[in-house]
Interface confidence: medium
């Protein structure tokens, strides 16, 4: 649709406006612009014929208009009288006419405003201040800004005089801010310079910092006083009622118990003539001793021993605190605190209980921490792991096995081949192996402190021939569109290539198929019923190759939307109704029927002999697959007509 967009819509006097044409039809004869909301020859501005590229001025042409080939009209040096509607009349080559109307408004540019005030130094909670935005301007909107934000809602703020005057009643210190006024019309906005309101207030009740009132003997006492006040307050200090000094800060080095007492700060505002005071009571205490931790068992055995940690020294009427790993104590049935919190007992320690542990003594001032203590928990050995994980080797290569078992203190290792001790090392190395090196390789790990031993046995086969591989699966009955299946080709063999086949073909390219682990593992993401195929893996090296037996993937799916047959929906009275329901599903679904919502029988086939019009209604077949946990259904409407009344109806089965 032909439309006119005025850019801008609101135009400043002296500027220009473009009446921009959108969706101008193709194949035009010409177009013409008119002042006003309709085509009126007496108000034509300019016409343009495309074939001749000739523009013809009309009665309303002012010499400030320029017409462009795309029909847009530029009006320059805008005057107030240009405000209003403009109509474009377009004549297409096929003589179909279109017209569209646009409009714009003209406004004057505004001068920069300024703020006048009736009170330059108002007193808090006493005076009012009226700001006025100058000059007074016709057709302008007045706005006010406080700290460059719009005016907050407040019963103490009142706008009047067409928003030109802003009055603050009962000024407060929070009114001390930067005030600006702004004049606006649709084409310009001008802000005044800021005026800062200087509100006299205070002093408030002074605050003495720091807030703590308890000190240790020997510390420095450094008190600071502050009272909100404009102009800033003058300060005086009194100790136990005796004047000390006229400063904002009071400093007493190396205090003793004798420095305990009442400390008063007085604040004075010379402009408002007000005084305010605040008193704090300071108590100086003697220094307590630093705590330390004792243990009843420095080398506890995992899962056997308990450990009792005690915070020393014992002090009457003292609070004891504990930390583990720089955190407060976790809630655990294996952690027990004595009634006075001085002893922490760890029941049946584990290797994770090493700490560090800290205790603290809390007095009126602070908490004194002990040095950290770390428990040496004896554990292991765990079942050793032998690496690498290969079980098949080719003759002539070097066999290098490494054994590791978690243990404290570190385990001592022994290697046995077919039950015969070989060496007491963590690593076993045999160069240039042969078939005779096949056998059972045992790693034994021993913890001398706990006296415990653990072993792991690995079968090593040295053979030029690769064994027949087999496929292991992480999911024997995956569900369609839900599960993933990972097949792994066993065994893991050194210097071996792994291959896969599906239904006797090499793997298809699919984003749902992914090989990993050196092609040993084949993962099928989001399995579908079409993935229920025979999978074979193969292993090969330079001298031999072998394939696994096929593994068929049993994908559980369905039930799909069932189908009721036969498709007929109209029957004659007296016919037999024999409906069969079928739904694709693995395993086969359970079927049930409902007629007009009433449950019937749990069979795949629904048979009703000699139906009558009473058998009219909706026949629903419900299918459910217990393995996938999914259900489905379909509804069929059956109409039974009295015999002979409707030709062309099915006679039934």
């Amino acid at each position: 649709k032909l439309t006119i967009e005025s850019t801008p819509f609101n135009v400043a006097e002296g500027k220009e406006v473009l009446l921009l044409v959108h969706n101008l039809p193709q194949h035009l004869f010409g177009y013409s612009w008119y002042k006003g909301e309709r085509v009126d020859g007496n108000r034509q501005i300019i016409g343009y014929v495309i074939g001749t590229q000739q523009a013809t001025p009309g009665p309303a042409y002012s010499g400030r208009e320029i017409i462009y080939p795309n029909a847009s009209l530029l009006i320059q040096n805008i005057i107030q009288n240009d405000t209003g509607f403009y109509t474009l009349h377009v004549i297409k080559s096929d003589l179909v006419n279109e017209e569209a109307t646009g409009q714009f408004r003209v406004y004057p540019e505004l001068p920069k405003p300024s703020i006048s005030s009736n009170n330059s130094k108002p007193v808090e909670d006493k005076d009012a201040v009226a700001f006025t935005c100058e000059p007074e301007t016709q057709d302008a909107t007045y706005l006010w800004w406080v700290n460059n934000q719009s005016l907050p809602v407040s019963p103490r703020l009142q706008l009047s005089n067409g928003n030109r005057t802003l009055t603050l009643f009962n000024v407060t210190r929070n009114d001390t801010a930067s005030y600006k006024c702004e004049t606006q019309n649709p084409v310009s906005a001008r802000r005044s310079d800021s005026v800062i309101l200087n509100v006299l207030y205070g002093p408030d009740a002074p605050t003495i910092s720091p807030l703590n009132t308890s000190y240790r003997s020997g510390e420095n006492l450094n008190l600071s006083c502050h009272a909100a006040s404009n102009p800033p307050a003058q300060y005086s200090w009194f100790v136990n009622g005796t004047f000390q000094q006229s400063t904002q800060e009071l400093f007493i080095p190396n205090i003793t118990v004798n420095n305990s007492g009442s400390y008063t700060c007085q604040a004075h505002n010379s402009d408002t003539g007000l005084n305010r005071t605040t008193v704090t009571t300071i108590t100086v205490y003697a220094e307590p001793p630093k705590p330390f931790i004792t243990s009843n068992n420095s080398n506890p055995v995992e899962d056997e021993d308990a450990v009792a940690l005690t915070c020393e020294p014992e002090i009457q009427n003292t609070t004891y605190l504990w930390w583990v790993n720089n955190q407060s104590l976790p809630v655990s049935p294996r952690l027990q605190l004595s009634n006075d919190n001085r002893t922490l007992t760890l029941l049946s320690v584990t290797r994770n209980d090493v700490g560090p542990y800290e205790c603290g003594i809390q007095n009126e001032l602070s908490v004194d921490h002990s040095d950290p203590v770390i428990l040496n928990v004896l554990y292991g050995p765990d079942d050793p792991t032998i690496s690498p994980s290969y079980t098949y080797y080719r003759p002539g290569v070097n066999l290098s096995l490494s054994c590791h078992a978690a243990s404290n203190p570190p385990a001592q290792y022994s290697w046995l081949i077919d039950g015969n001790i070989q060496q007491h090392t963590q690593e076993l190395f045999i160069s240039n192996i042969t078939e005779k090196n096949s056998g059972l390789y045992t790693c034994q790990a021993n913890n001398s402190a706990s006296g415990h031993s653990r072993t792991t046995v690995k079968t090593i086969t040295v053979s030029a021939e690769l064994p027949k591989p087999s496929i292991s699966s992480n999911n024997s009955k995956p569900v369609e569109d839900k599960d993933a299946v990972a097949f792994t080709c066993e065994p893991e063999a050194q210097n071996t290539t792994y291959l896969w086949w599906v239904n006797g073909q090499s793997l298809p390219v699919s984003p749902r198929l992914q090989l990993s682990n050196g092609n040993r593992t084949l993962t099928l993401f989001n399995v579908t019923r079409n993935d229920a195929r025979a999978y074979v893996c193969g292993i090969q090296n330079s001298v031999s190759a072998n394939r696994s037996d096929p593994v068929t993937l049993d994908v559980l799916y369905g039930p799909d939307t069932p189908i009721i047959s036969p498709p007929d929906s109209s029957y004659l009275s007296g016919a037999n109704l024999n409906l069969s329901c079928h739904s694709a599903s693995n395993p086969s679904p359970q079927y049930s029927w409902r007629i007009n919502g009433i449950p019937q029988q749990h069979t795949q086939v629904l048979f009703i002999a000699k139906i009558t019009p009473n058998n009219n209604g909706t026949y629903a077949c419900f299918v459910s697959n217990l393995a996938t946990g999914r259900n489905n259904s379909i509804v069929k409407s059956i109409t039974v007509s009295a015999s002979g009344t409707s030709p062309g109806l099915s006679a039934g089965a």
């Epitope: 085509v39 009126d40 014929v49 074939g51 009349h89 297409k92 080559s93 096929d94 003589l95």
Partner: antibody
Framework: EVQLLESGGGLVQPGGSLRLSCAAS????????MGWVRQAPGKGLEWVSS????????SYADSVKGRFTISRDNSKNTLYLQMNSLRAEDTAVYYC??????????????WGQGTLVTVSS | DIQMTQSPSSLSASVGDRVTITCRAS??????LNWYQQKPGKAPKLLIY???SLQSGVPSRFSGSGSGTDFTLTISSLQPEDFATYYC????????FGQGTKLEIK
């Protein structure tokens, strides 16, 4: 002086074809839009078709669309109307007329005297 | 399509009378309306274009007005040569005529 002279009318059977011509003189034919208007016996005027100065733009009334074709030969100053699949209701006097170029081609300012087409078996 | 309806379909008047014929469009056609005069056995003649513009050579007793959907042709003082059939034509979407108004001598 602007002159428009139609020819090619006559009696034709239903389903038949006829080609009307309009010879123009007295104005710049090649820059003018042209059109055909018909008037059935005793009836009112019915606009039939129009064509742009360069033959690129053509328009037809729904009643003749697909059966009639308007064309022009600017070298011969001649306008044509090829009428196919004629029906009894196409019987009328066919007028050739000119659209002015100034200010815009939105009315018919000069008309020919017309040629009679009779469709009858 | 845009339908044009003229009223009245026929009209009897005397020389010197002021006569008004109206034309209504089925949807707005702005000012894209023309008036033609046709005498028996003759080709139509353009009187008014663009609703109110008088064609060169046409007497000033003929005038047109209207915009949008309703238009009027006025003959201020009927002359003997003015008895004819008058047609309106919309030019907003090529280019249908009204059914005509027959002006007869009373």
């Amino acid at each position: 002086e602007v002159q428009l002279l139609e020819s090619g009318g006559g009696l034709v059977q239903p389903g038949g074809s006829l080609r009307l011509s309009c010879a123009a003189s007295g104005f710049t034919f090649s820059s003018s839009y042209m059109g055909w208007v018909r008037q059935a016996p005793g009836k009112g005027l019915e606009w039939v078709s129009s064509i742009g100065s360069g033959s690129y733009s053509t328009s037809y009334a729904d009643s003749v669309k697909g059966r009639f074709t308007i064309s022009r030969d600017n070298s011969k100053n001649t306008l044509y109307l090829q009428m196919n699949s004629l029906r009894a209701e196409d019987t009328a006097v066919y007028y050739c007329a000119r659209y002015p170029s100034v200010p815009f081609p939105l009315h018919l300012d000069y008309w020919g005297q017309g040629t009679l087409v009779t469709v009858s078996s | 399509d845009i339908q044009m309806t003229q009223s009245p379909s026929s009209l009897s008047a005397s020389v010197g009378d002021r006569v008004t014929i109206t034309c209504r469009a089925s949807q707005s056609i702005s000012s894209y309306l023309n008036w033609y005069q046709q005498k028996p056995g003759k080709a139509p003649k353009l009187l008014i274009y663009a609703a109110s513009s008088l064609q060169s050579g046409v007497p000033s007793r003929f005038s047109g007005s209207g915009s949008g959907t309703d238009f009027t042709l006025t003959i201020s003082s009927l002359q003997p040569e003015d008895f004819a059939t008058y047609y309106c034509q919309q030019a907003g979407n090529p280019h249908t005529f009204g059914q005509g108004t027959k002006l007869e001598i009373k």
